[in-house]
């Protein structure tokens, strides 16, 4: 922003009314009137170039300083070329001196040179030569000087002529202010420019109405330079929640719009599934049945719990069930869907039911599932199971209702026994097996069927209540096909795979463990 000038003294504008003091009185400087563009102009001039040793003073009236700390003095003047005078006037000069004196009171006509301090010697950039003078084409010079810091109530300026031909057309004394400013939604008051060139006056700004310093942000500050220019902005204000920046002000969000926090962003339209907001809203309330999770930004549409997993199937495989489902048709507008699987078992005889989480095994933890399938094992035979798959999202906890689908399955068989060969000899095979512990109580006996490989006409059966058996009276170096099946009160369970086990040849005799 451009500096603002406050004029303390303007000779040209005063129309010769100022009545400055000349010393010595009646000699040297003289007030003259001229006509330029049909307007009278006044000037103080002096032209004692032929006489030697000139010391002519022109002192301004006392100027009240007011709030100025540094003043700027702008001079407009002409100087005639010494060579334009006969003989070059050996005592002729082409410069004059500028002085100032501070005081707390007006000394009136009491003029004392010793009180004045020299500011500078003023030399012209261009001098007016004879031909210019005769053609009334004078060369006007403009020079500016500054003085500061000033501390007294007022001051005088003085011009010392030492033998030049000078006409002083304008003397303008002013000080500079940094103008009132609105920047970054902060108001900076009009500030007097400092007096020391290297230093900048720090000025605190105040946030405009409905603007605030953001949390953790810096208070708005600007620096007012000597020349009245604002420099180095620091910090800023932002329109508070519910308001947006319109030019240099903060305006309330229109109805149907909101702004959640102090920021540079404009007000946003209320998102989907919200109610129309009033003017100046910081958020938009959710429609009935829609919610915001604590971590949801205000700009996100309100959402609702998902519908149930849409399709669900339970495929029984022995004492295992694979549950597969598809995502909800209605995600509720969210992507953070997880699934939970729960299990209930019912005894067909009594119709009694209860949870079965403790007795079954899931292929992965059954809560917070992101995949859409899970395998449940260690199911008991001859039991009815109902599986519930629930879909949840980030707002499900805000409602009491649940979104679930159920599937029922009856386990009719035990899981096939896992069979291994424990030892063998030329005439025997020692076989053991296992089934999941939850199913063991349902098993009455185990049936071991074996026959020679390639002989489909005859087979042998052994029944036992234990988990192992030794098959004797076998032929040496012969492969036998062995299968184990659990027998329950309700009938046969699932049979194991058919295993091929070979007895030892006579050369490799001895009971060798495998």
């Amino acid at each position: 922003a451009q500096g603002k000038e406050v004029v303390l003294l303007d000779f040209a504008a005063a129309g010769g009314e100022l009545g400055w003091l000349t010393h010595p009185y009646g000699k040297g400087w003289d007030l003259m009137q001229n006509i330029m563009n049909d307007m009278p102009i006044y000037m103080y001039s002096v032209c004692n170039v032929m006489s030697g040793d000139q010391d002519n003073w022109l002192r301004t009236n006392w100027v009240y300083r007011g709030e100025a700390e540094r003043i700027f003095i702008e001079l407009k003047f002409t100087v005639r070329d010494c060579n334009s005078f006969p003989g070059g006037a050996s005592s002729c000069k082409e410069t004059f001196n500028l002085y100032y004196a501070e005081s707390d009171l007006d000394y009136g006509t009491n003029f004392q040179k010793r009180l004045f301090t020299k500011i500078d010697t003023i030399a012209p950039d261009e001098i007016t030569v004879s031909s210019d003078f005769e053609a009334r084409h004078v060369k006007l010079n403009v020079e500016e000087r500054s003085v500061g810091p000033l501390t007294r109530k007022g001051f005088y300026l003085a011009f010392q002529d030492i033998g030049a031909c000078v006409a002083l057309l304008s003397v303008r004394v002013y000080y500079k202010k940094c103008p009132e400013l609105l920047q970054g939604l902060a108001h900076f008051p009009e500030t007097i420019a400092g007096s020391d060139a290297p230093s900048l006056a720090t000025v605190a700004g105040t946030c405009v109405d409905h603007a605030v310093v953001p949390p953790g942000g810096e208070e708005p500050r600007m620096h007012c330079a000597v020349d009245g220019e604002w420099l180095v902005p620091i910090g800023q204000c932002l329109c508070q929640a519910g308001y947006e920046k319109v030019e240099d002000a903060c305006q309330a969000c229109s109805p149907g719009f909101f702004k959640f926090e102090a920021s540079e962003s404009p007000c946003l339209e209320c998102p989907e599934h919200t109610l129309p907001s009033p003017e100046g809203a910081t958020s938009c309330e959710c429609e009935e049945g829609f919610f915001r999770a604590p971590q949801d930004p205000a700009s996100m549409p309100c959402t609702r719990p998902p519908s149930a997993p849409h399709y669900l199937t339970a495929v029984g495989m022995g004492a295992k069930v694979e549950l597969r489902w598809t995502p909800p048709q209605d995600s509720g507008g969210r992507e953070d869907i997880v699934y939970s699987v729960t299990c209930e078992q019912c005894w067909p005889e009594s119709g009694e039911c209860g949870p079965c989480e403790a007795s079954v095994r899931y292929s992965e933890p059954p809560h917070g599932l992101t995949r859409t399938s899970v395998t449940v094992s260690d199911l008991e035979p001859h039991m009815n199971y109902t599986f519930t798959v629930e879909a949840r999202n980030g707002v499900s906890g805000l409602v009491t209702s649940r979104s679930f689908r159920t599937a029922s399955v009856s386990i009719n068989q035990t899981e096939p026994p896992k069979v291994r060969l424990e030892g063998r000899s030329t005439t025997s095979l020692s076989v053991s097996w296992s089934i999941p512990p939850p199913q063991q109580s349902r098993v009455w006996k185990y049936e071991v069927t074996y026959r020679k490989k390639g002989d489909s006409n005859s087979y042998n059966v052994r029944r036992t209540e234990g988990f192992s058996v030794t098959l004797d009276d076998l032929a040496p170096d012969t492969t036998y096909l062995v299968q184990v099946q659990a027998l329950t009160q309700e009938g046969q369970g699932a049979g194991s795979k058919v295993h091929e086990f070979q007895t030892l040849s006579p050369e490799g005799s001895g009971n060798l463990a495998v």
Partner: antibody, heavy 120, light 107 residues
Framework: EVQLVESGGGLVKPGGSLKLSCEAS????????MYWVRQTPEKRLEWVAT????????HYLDSVKGRFTISRDNAQNNLYLQMSSLKSDDTAMYYC?????????????WGQGTLVTVSA | DIVMTQSHKFMSTSVGDRVRITCKAS??????VAWYQQKPGQSPKLLIY???TRHTGVPDRFTGSGSGTDYSLTISSVQAEDLALYYC?????????FGGGTKLEIK
């Protein structure tokens, strides 16, 4: 026995409107999501719209969004498809469909269809 | 959207033959694939769902299989009444999408 009977099809000019109906019987209508599926003259099958059992959720094929509205009247066991700003691409046989019992299977039951022809 | 691709628009077979119609999904659909049969002048009818489960009343000559992105419908011994259009459909996520169809023709 599950029965779905569509009606309301016919010849309509581009930009025109039509409302299809599907009357359901033989099951508890308010227990099921319902669908409209169409079959283009080239025999391509295309799901068009879904409505939840209570009517609170609807979902549409992108190309019909804003032009078609699926709705239901659970008291009257009726499903509707309001079609507006019709285009020649909407020419198809329109079927209403229902999932299987307890949502174990998709589109287990279909109506006989109603033909919509969009032509100048 | 999930794209279902049936690479054969037509398949020609003889009564008693074994025929396999294939379908490929553009992403894993976790076996949520259904097969529909549409005879001329009729509505589509569900044959298979969840990739391999036969719908009520469907003859056991129809078998579905597959996982991930690759699925197939096999008719073990084609009958004259199997002349129809066969569509696969993913019922995993909306929009539920269908394959372009395979027309089974009897030689």
């Amino acid at each position: 026995e599950v029965q779905l009977v569509e009606s309301g099809g016919g010849l309509v000019k581009p930009g025109g409107s039509l409302k299809l109906s599907c009357e359901a019987s033989g099951f508890t209508f308010s227990d099921y999501y319902m669908y409209w599926v169409r079959q283009t003259p080239e025999k391509r099958l295309e799901w068009v719209a879904t409505i939840s059992d209570d009517g609170s959720f609807t979902h549409y094929l992108d190309s019909v969004k804003g032009r078609f509205t699926i709705s239901r009247d659970n008291a009257q066991n009726n499903l509707y498809l309001q079609m507006s700003s019709l285009k020649s691409d909407d020419t198809a046989m329109y079927y209403c469909a229902r999932d299987g019992y307890r949502y174990d299977r998709p589109f287990a039951y279909w109506g006989q269809g109603t033909l919509v022809t969009v032509s100048a | 959207d999930i794209v279902m691709t049936q690479s054969h628009k037509f398949m020609s077979t003889s009564v008693g033959d074994r025929v396999r119609i294939t379908c490929k999904a553009s992403q894993d659909v976790n076996t949520a694939v259904a097969w529909y049969q549409q005879k001329p002048g009729q509505s589509p009818k569900l044959l298979i769902y969840w990739a391999s489960t036969r719908h009520t009343g469907v003859p056991d000559r129809f078998t579905g299989s597959g996982s991930g992105t690759d699925y197939s419908l096999t008719i073990s011994s084609v009958q004259a009444e199997d002349l129809a259009l066969y569509y696969c459909q993913q019922h995993y996520s909306t929009p539920y999408t269908f394959g372009g169809g395979t027309k089974l023709e009897i030689k």
